[in-house]
Amino acid sequence: MSKGEELFTGVVPILVELDGDVNGHKFSVSGEGEGDATYGKLTLKFICTTGKLPVPWPTLVTTFSYGVQCFSRYPDHMKQHDFFKSAMPEGYVQERTIFFKDDGNYKTRAEVKFEGDTLVNRIELKGIDFKEDGNILGHKLEYNYNSHNVYIMADKQKNGIKVNFKIRHNIEDGSVQLADHYQQNTPIGDGPVLLPDNHYLSTQSALSKDPNEKRDHMVLLEFVTAAGITHGMDELYK
């Protein structure tokens, strides 16, 4: 078990703060909830503290919760591939470029680390080149989320990882908006981190609303499990 992994044996409180600017539309989001890495479970609630969110909530899910991939459940035989927990408590910087097909792109930079006993994800997001009447600024996405696989590989030069995946957002007319994600994670501290073999995270997310909440908001339940690396030969012969 890495030193960082020991911090995730119970339920951990999570805070998320995002400052965004998409095509000049500035906004802020606060999120709170809890994570339980034993089950790869996240429960979070987000509110837009600046009024109405200028982009659809589903376009921010990867920035919020795929931001705290340290809560992914890594099976016993894969724990030596868990970069995310090994970087804690000092944490990691997570940078992404998200290309929305036939539309604009988000660039995000986040610092994910422990502040006391709380896991904090502080994010800056800049979005450019979006069509004012497109699927994103035109709010044409359905309020739901598909399951995805998130592919992880080591980046030895930067002592971190590179991550690629393609999100499929459902559009109200029945079509799909693709969002290509290019991600890089580097540790904040200078302690040792685990550099993984290639594998993936399997994610399932459910979006809902709080019937008593009048502010623009999103409630998120997510389960994330690491997969893609088989038991070694010695395991087979036990």
Epitope: P13, L15, E32, T49, G116, D117, T118
Partner: nanobody, 124 residues
Framework: DVQLQESGGGLVQAGGSLRLSCAAS????????LGWFRQAPGKEREFVAA????????DYADFVKGRFMISRENAKNTAYLQMNSLKPEDTAVYFC?????????????????WGQGTQVTVSS
Amino acid sequence: DVQLQESGGGLVQAGGSLRLSCAASGGTFSILSLGWFRQAPGKEREFVAAISRSEGSTDYADFVKGRFMISRENAKNTAYLQMNSLKPEDTAVYFCAASYARRLSTTASRVLYWGQGTQVTVSS
């Protein structure tokens, strides 16, 4: 998702006491900071008292110091507000609030989790 349910409100004479309860579900109670706000008709929702996570340190608004006491019982997933020496100006709807931050914000707009409220009326 965290759900909060208040109880214990009612009508009381000036100088009397009430004890409000806030039962939490849907989250891990021991890692929530909890508190109470109140809202009188035509006024903004204002902070009353808060109790932090496991260590239990407390904050109070100046206007209730020495009269109100906040406490929590982790085994029952419940927070309490003991209100003594009540005054007519304490009449309001009292809301339970929760946060995963170590300390609950004293600014209502920054609080994510709320109960539905319980009415407290203090007659003179």
